[in-house]
């Protein structure tokens, strides 16, 4: 069977939504009313990987686009990027590790840890309109906690 994928949106713990910023970047900003339609809808796939009650391996694609969040080394630093893939082959149950995030939920907080780079998380800045990035610190200035809203297909 193919991998099961469900549509969702994400907001950081400051209630900032995620929107496209150019063809290969996401940014986080506060949206209201009709502007909420700008927010990115992810297709979250439940992929193969180590799983527990609090930790579920997922891949985060952009709905109806052949773009996936992936984690790679750039200048020796773990970096978040939007990577284009062949839609004939993706999504799949056995995603390459760079595409896999551990969705971790503990005490009303949802984090997305890179499977490729443990202890590196999808992060947003406190400031408005800044890029979504891969951060190596939790509990500091940068935001690593999210809420998730599933949406109908």
């Amino acid at each position: 069977a193919p991998v099961r994928s469900l549509n969702c949106t994400l907001r950081d713990s400051q209630q900032k939504s995620l929107v496209m910023s150019g063809p290969y970047e996401l940014k986080a900003l506060h949206l209201q009313g009709q502007d909420m339609e700008q927010q990115v809808v992810f297709s979250m796939s439940f992929v193969q990987g180590e799983e527990s009650n609090d930790k579920i391996p997922v891949a985060l694609g952009l709905k109806e686009k052949n773009l996936y969040l992936s984690c790679v080394l750039k200048d020796d630093k773990p970096t978040l990027q939007l990577e284009s893939v062949d839609p004939k082959n993706y999504p799949k149950k056995k995603m390459e590790k760079r595409f896999v995030f551990n969705k971790i939920e503990i005490n009303n907080k949802l984090e997305f840890e890179s499977a490729q780079f443990p202890n590196w998380y999808i992060s947003t800045s406190q400031a408005e309109n800044m890029p979504v990035f891969l951060g190596g610190t939790k509990g500091g200035q940068d935001i690593t906690d999210f809420t998730m809203q599933f949406v109908s297909s």
């Epitope: 099961r4 994928s5 579920i56 939920e105 503990i106 999210f146 998730m148 809203q149 297909s153």
Partner: antibody, heavy 119, light 107 residues
Framework: EVQLVESGGGVVQPGRSLRLSCSAS????????MSWVRQAPGKGLEWVAY????????YYPDTVKGRFTISRDNSKNTLFLQMDSLRPEDTAVYYC????????????WGQGTLVTVSS | GIQMTQSPSSLSASVGDRVTITCRAS??????LTWYQQTPGKAPKLLIY???TLADGVPSRFSGSCSGTDYTFTISSLQPEDIATYYC?????????FGQGTKLQIT
Amino acid sequence: EVQLVESGGGVVQPGRSLRLSCSASGFIFSRYDMSWVRQAPGKGLEWVAYISHGGAGTYYPDTVKGRFTISRDNSKNTLFLQMDSLRPEDTAVYYCARGGVYKGYFDEWGQGTLVTVSS
Amino acid sequence: GIQMTQSPSSLSASVGDRVTITCRASGNIYDYLTWYQQTPGKAPKLLIYNAKTLADGVPSRFSGSCSGTDYTFTISSLQPEDIATYYCQHFWSLPYTFGQGTKLQIT
């Protein structure tokens, strides 16, 4: 023994609000996703709200989106459904159920509480 | 979303009969299907998940199978306590929807 006990149902006028509660026992509540499923009189089943085990994930179908809000208090083993702008078509027995988006099915159910929306 | 069409809507059978209920999905749901039993005045009860896995404590006379997008629920030998309405439900894509139900009566 798993027990889910709903409360808070009753008769309410269209446009008004109601808050349902579900008290859980017999399992570790904070480890389970939870949902509300409703059944209009003599009709079938409809899933109306979901919340993940920690409370960070939610889902509502289009029929109730923007009007219903699901929440939970894991310290009190209690699930809630805040229902605003109620309509006559919201009249139903509302069941609290264990399960949701990830597992996909509901393996434990409460006995239900009847909500009647009528002027 | 995916619609589940359940048939028949009602049926009568005798104790000891083999009873079959069918659910047809409007799209492929890859065995992400559940069956519930609801006895009169009670809450639904999980019987089968993943199309053919029996839930804990469910008698072995109940079973599930599939062929393509058609899913079948079978009671091999009907018992008086099986008087109920049976529902299928898919959980492949949101919204997860239920079939309309099949009311089973004993003749």
